[in-house]
Amino acid sequence: RKIPKVGHTFFQKPESCPPVPEGSMKLDTGIINENQRVSMSRNIESRSTSPWNYTVTWDPNRYPSEVVQAQCKHLGCINAQGKEDISMNSVPIQQETLVLRRKHQGCSVSFQLEKVLVTVGCTCVTPVVHHVQ
Amino acid sequence: RKIPKVGHTFFQKPESCPPVPEGSMKLDTGIINENQRVSMSRNIESRSTSPWNYTVTWDPNRYPSEVVQAQCKHLGCINAQGKEDISMNSVPIQQETLVLRRKHQGCSVSFQLEKVLVTVGCTCVTPVVHHVQ
């Protein structure tokens, strides 16, 4: 699902307040709900009818430093006999997510949000078939 | 996939620099890659063998204000005949993502990252069957 553009008003103070200096805001350290955890079933990537692999990208100037991308293993889906059925499609499920980018120039450190496209897993889809004339 | 805890060093300046005031950092406004877009196929949520619906949550003090959650429509998966096959499982695919929380006390506005658990879609899984003695 896509993230809309950040509204100009999001970073502004209430109208009755003196304006904020242009370009930067105060970011509190620490993360709300930092201990919240994914409770996804074990090994769904290998037991799915549209299985996938994971690739990890690493960047020490990004939080989270580790971003995991899924790649569907097959074009088709795995049937009850464990064979690939090419009449069906393994299709990636994508999500726009935010990461925090650390930028330093000398001793000046600042942070900026960055939008990243993550493929989270795959799903099996029945395509509608058309014959081109 | 889960986001690890933010390391204490992530918000620190290089060792040779004077230390940062505890508790807050400079956040640049604007978003890197803001125009990047999900290229997910239309209607995969209804064409999937593990179809899902979407629910939208809205919070004006969060960026993005709109967070979309998927819910699997069925316990089982849809077979080639369009019937639910309860020997298979529709399973949610979850992703930890970051949002930006806006906090104001009077005219003081600050921001903090918040971890949110998003169900992005569903996949069809072959369950491991155990018979309990």
Partner: nanobody
Framework: DVQLVESGGGLVQPGGSLRLSCAAS????????MGWFRQAPGKEREFVAG????????EYADSVKGRFTISRDNSKNTVYLQMNSLRPEDTAVYYC?????????WGQGTLVTVSS
């Protein structure tokens, strides 16, 4: 609407080579994969080869592995099938497939005949 233009079929001797191409146009955005199926006289249609658009991942039928190579040109929305060491049993109508994940388009086919 979507158009598929297939070309490159023809008559070739056993052991020879052919290169099929299929160009997609029209509303062919967000391609999932493109590939080829074939149908020999009196037989069922079978998968030959496919290539995923996002990362060029390829799949082949066991019967053509090592002899056929599928490739793509993203900028032209075109897929190619290089067929080497052709055998009489490769004789068939070869159909191009354009897959957009939830919709799949089939071309009209191009005839490949392998005969001496």
């Amino acid at each position: 609407d979507v158009q598929l233009v297939e070309s490159g079929g023809g008559l070739v001797q056993p052991g020879g080579s052919l290169r099929l191409s299929c160009a997609a146009s029209g509303r062919a955005s967000s391609i999932n994969w493109m590939g080829w199926f074939r149908q020999a006289p009196g037989k069922e249609r079978e998968f030959v080869a496919g290539i995923r658009w996002s990362d060029a991942y390829t799949e082949y039928a066991d019967s053509v592995k090592g002899r056929f190579t599928i490739s793509r040109d993203n900028s032209k929305n075109t897929v190619y099938l290089q067929m080497n060491s052709l055998r009489p049993e490769d004789t068939a109508v070869y159909y191009c497939v354009l897959d957009l994940s939830t919709v799949r388009y089939w071309g009209q086919g191009t005839l490949v005949t392998v005969s001496s």
